[in-house]
């Protein structure tokens, strides 16, 4: 099989996250996001900071960006919603939902992810799955077929040491270790799922990839019901 | 359709500078890394550095640190090369690269008084 | 540092020969990248993550290896297959190339 990584992952088995999304400007992948409802994508906000004077599109049901399959599809985008206090210059509240032109079309390679509302933090050590169409290795290059990789959950403190992020790991943050294995240029916007529950979104802050001391940083999603709920009501 | 179009052919003094420019087109720099790659006549291809354009962060091959500076401008979609020092073993053709997948055509550079 | 050597130095092969050549690490690898080189023009790279053919090249290039032995074959020589092939590690920084081997045709 080929050897291409997330940084350190595999190629994913096809259709097997059938949440998963890419967020597209002018037709090249840009982007991760995950299907939280029939007509809605989470991704993260710093994805459309240049994306002004271009056409933003979901792809839904993809395992290769390029070839042809039956379950995929692009679909307009109707509304873009960034968190309002998202800012281009901090990592905090870096998420975005985006409104469908219609209901996707479901089916066995593309279903909506069971998103956490409880509002609490996942214990240290826990294996998550992040997946995306981002980076996979040190020279930079883009793959075309979906890859996916297990990371250990960091605990925050750790994660906040002067040698790591240095506190800027909010509460509403969490952060997966990065040793080889990591999330990377264009996974931003992507799932971090916690058995088969969407815990976290891939930051799109400028970070050093797959190195151990700057740990992967993630949104939690639990911590923004309350906003998620008001947008998909 | 992706290109990289590299900066001319260059004659500069010992000890001086030279900055090379590498401008992309038909893709977005900072979506990957940018690499610089020395060629040698008979001495085959070094690795220089890379930059990611998004954020501005460089590695280097300690053996080129402190004489080689990679930058990026994304709003011109352009890399930079910058030699500093120049002695008659930078005599090269540099090359940059795009996730080392598409390559510019190079620019020779010769150091000579 | 890991350092790539790549064997032989130069070979040669008549049209329709099968070529093999070799790139081995001073300690191992995950993957390895193989670039193909013509006199007066750029790299051009042939194979990533070990065995995947980047997009144009043709099949009759193939490429294998794990740990610290790496090789990249040809099945069948062609005339514009002649040229210069670097290997090059991206699993360990520095990432670096190999000295090259450079291939004839006969």
């Known amino acids: 099989p080929p050897r291409g990584r997330i940084l350190g992952g595999r190629e994913a088995e096809a259709h097997a996250r059938p949440y998963m999304a890419s967020v597209q400007l002018n037709g090249a992948h840009l982007c991760g996001g995950v299907l939280v409802a029939e007509q809605w994508v989470l991704s993260a906000a710093h994805c459309l900071e240049d994306a002004a004077d271009g056409k933003v599109q979901v792809l839904l049901g993809a395992h290769s960006l390029s070839q042809p399959e039956p379950s995929k599809r692009l679909y307009d985008v109707l509304r873009a919603v960034p968190h309002p206090d998202s800012q281009p210059d901090t990592i905090d509240h870096d998420l975005l939902l985006l409104q469908l032109s219609e209901k996707a079309t479901l089916g066995p390679a593309v279903r909506p992810l069971p998103w956490q509302r409880v509002d609490r933090d996942v214990a240290p050590g826990t294996l998550c799955d992040v997946a995306g169409w981002g980076i996979v290795n040190h020279a930079g290059r883009r793959p075309d077929s979906l890859q996916h990789v297990l990371l250990p959950v960091l605990d925050r403190a750790t994660c906040n040491r002067r040698t790591h992020h240095d506190g800027a790991i909010t509460e509403r943050l969490m952060c997966a270790e990065s040793n080889r294995r990591d999330s990377c240029k264009g996974d931003s916007g992507g799932p971090l799922v916690c058995g088969g529950v969407l815990e976290g979104v891939v930051t799109s802050g400028s970070r050093v990839c797959g190195n151990r001391k700057k740990p992967g940083i993630y949104t939690r999603v639990a911590s923004y019901a309350a906003w998620i709920d008001s947008v998909l009501a | 359709e992706v290109q990289l179009q590299q900066s001319g052919a260059e004659l500069v003094k010992p000890g001086a500078s030279v900055k090379l420019s590498c401008t992309a087109s038909?893709?977005?720099?900072?979506?990957?890394?940018m690499h610089w790659v020395k060629e040698r006549p008979d001495q085959g291809l070094e690795w220089i550095g890379r930059?990611?354009?998004?954020?501005?962060?460089?590695k280097y091959d300690p053996k080129f640190q402190g004489k080689a500076t990679i930058t990026a401008d994304t709003s011109s979609n352009t890399a930079y090369l910058q030699l500093s020092s120049l002695t008659s073993e930078d005599t090269a053709v540099y090359y940059c690269?795009?996730?080392?997948?598409?390559w510019g055509q190079g620019t020779s550079v010769t150091v000579s008084s | 540092q890991i350092i790539l050597t790549q064997s032989p130095a130069i070979m040669s092969a008549s049209p329709g020969e099968k070529v093999t050549m070799t790139c081995s690490a001073s300690s191992s690898v995950s993957n390895m990248y193989w670039y193909q080189q013509k006199p007066g023009s750029s790299p051009r790279l042939l194979i990533y993550d070990t065995s995947n053919l980047a997009s144009g090249v043709p099949v009759r290039f193939s490429g294998s290896g794990s740990g610290a032995s790496y090789s990249l074959t040809i099945s069948r020589m062609e005339a514009e297959d002649a040229a210069t092939y670097y290997c090059?590690?991206?699993?360990?920084?520095?990432?670096?190339f190999g000295g090259g081997t450079k291939l004839e045709i006969k």
């Open positions: 690269a795009n996730a080392m997948d598409y």
């Open positions: 930059i990611d354009p998004a954020n501005g962060n460089t």
């Open positions: 038909g893709f977005k720099i900072k979506d990957t890394y």
């Open positions: 090059q590690q991206w699993s360990s920084y520095p990432w670096t």
